[in-house]
Interface confidence: low
Amino acid sequence: YSHWPSCCPSKGYPSEELLRWSTVPVPPLKPASLDFHSVSCRASEDGPLNSRAISPWRYELDRDLNRLPQDLYHARCLCPHCVSLQTGSHMDPRGNSELLYHNQTVFYRRPCHGKKGNHKGYCLERRLYRVSLACVCVRPRVMG
Amino acid sequence: YSHWPSCCPSKGYPSEELLRWSTVPVPPLKPASLDFHSVSCRASEDGPLNSRAISPWRYELDRDLNRLPQDLYHARCLCPHCVSLQTGSHMDPRGNSELLYHNQTVFYRRPCHGKKGNHKGYCLERRLYRVSLACVCVRPRVMG
């Protein structure tokens, strides 16, 4: 796996593009065995995890070339409730299909500048970015 | 949220430690409503998602001060099968509790060096790091 160039001063590194935004093709950081085509509210008996789940989901691509990672994937639940383990298709209203969220560390590129204001490549700014990872079958909350 | 310093040449930035590894305490990037204490194979009717799931899990901290993010959390399934939606405690052998994995982009700090071999701060190397995000209740694979 070709790693992203290090963030080091570019001055005096004629052979390396150390501060540059990495534009080398990088394998997209897809969830394992990504399945964009599971679009029905049913639990399959084969295929990737998101289609075999009783809280099945699909992935939506979120691409931003000025962010690392450039590609993020958001889960989208295909059913409001969970699918019956028995049939794999009927919904069981005793369970809810809920999104699991995560604040992921991402880096945005911004122009960065030298002492004299000249453009010195791109800087990275660390940010938290909310992504939905998966749909999870949960027991509904019982309010006290 | 105090962002991690930008990756820019340190030369000519006397007031900023732009290339330095940020050692300012950063709020750990915990999964929302993190619950380390859900250690039983049951689906709760309240609390965070990982304890209400019928494939409940706990989180294990993976801390590396030479990595960004420094704190990662790995899901660990608490049950081999899914918990019954009806009772919230008995296992239903028709469903398996499986880990959902993701190759997350992380950055490791490495010493970086100038043209003459002198130490120029720290560089970042991009890597893919396998993390388990959650446990998902799935229908077992039916082999063809």
Epitope: P14, S15, T23, P111, Y122 | -
Partner: antibody, heavy 120, light 113 residues
């Protein structure tokens, strides 16, 4: 005085691959960013993508699946390949240099452009 | 993508008169840390490649006559030709180089009235 010259076939059949080369003279291709831009007849300019002399590339997402830009530092050249062309790819294709030896400013040196027609 | 729009599409100005072209970006291309706008203006004469006139929204390139000036910040920019000359007949494009993909405005055609 750096000069750029585009070369390649002026006529390409639909579904084939358009291939163009930009030759840099009067200076080195090293340490600069180099872009391809196109201009359909009577229309505006569209940035296709750039390459750094080290080989790093960045493409316009609207064309990304069909574009490859490569560099040959030994020949002081960089090239454009655009696959599966249609009539909509008929345009004047320009190569250009970015106005800095280490970053992506505006484009200060342009080739004269070469007209590519996609037709059977 | 950052969308660049220009107005007017075309304008005709008498020799020696002022010509003004505006350019708008769909999001700010001002970098707050150094107060620079990542905007360029190009001139394209018939049958020729574009020529870089102005960088950083207002910095004239070497050899460009001082009748050309750029102004504006954030999302709104202007190219002014203070005293139009016959050789200024061309199409003028603005372009942002803040984020990829780099994008151009649709162009403004300037003619002599």
């Amino acid at each position: 005085q750096v000069q750029l010259q585009e070369s390649g076939p002026g006529l390409v059949k639909p579904s084939e691959t358009l291939s163009l080369t930009c030759t840099v003279s009067g200076g080195s291709i090293s340490s600069y960013y180099w872009s391809w831009i196109r201009q359909p007849p009577g229309k505006g300019l569209e940035w296709i993508g750039f390459i750094y002399y080290s080989g790093s590339t960045n493409y316009n997402p609207s064309l990304k699946s069909r574009v490859t830009i490569s560099v040959d530092t030994s020949k002081n050249q960089f090239s454009l390949k655009l696959s599966s062309v249609t009539a909509a790819d008929t345009a004047v294709y320009y190569c250009a240099r970015h106005d800095s030896d280490y970053e992506l400013y505006g484009m200060d040196v342009w080739g004269q452009g070469t007209t590519v027609t996609v037709s059977s | 993508d950052i969308v660049m729009t220009q107005s007017p599409d075309s304008l005709a100005v008498s020799l020696g008169e002022r010509a003004t072209i505006t350019c708008k970006s769909s999001q700010s291309i001002l970098y707050n840390s150094d107060n620079k706008n990542y905007l360029a203006w190009y001139q394209q004469k018939s049958g020729q490649p574009p020529k870089l006139l102005i960088s950083w929204a207002s910095t004239r390139e070497s050899g460009v006559p001082d009748r050309f000036s750029g102004s504006g910040s954030g999302t709104d920019f202007t190219l002014t030709i203070s005293s139009l000359q016959a050789e200024d007949v061309a199409v003028y494009y603005c372009q942002q180089y803040f984020f990829t993909p780099f994008t151009f405005g649709p162009g403004t055609k300037v003619d002599i009235k």
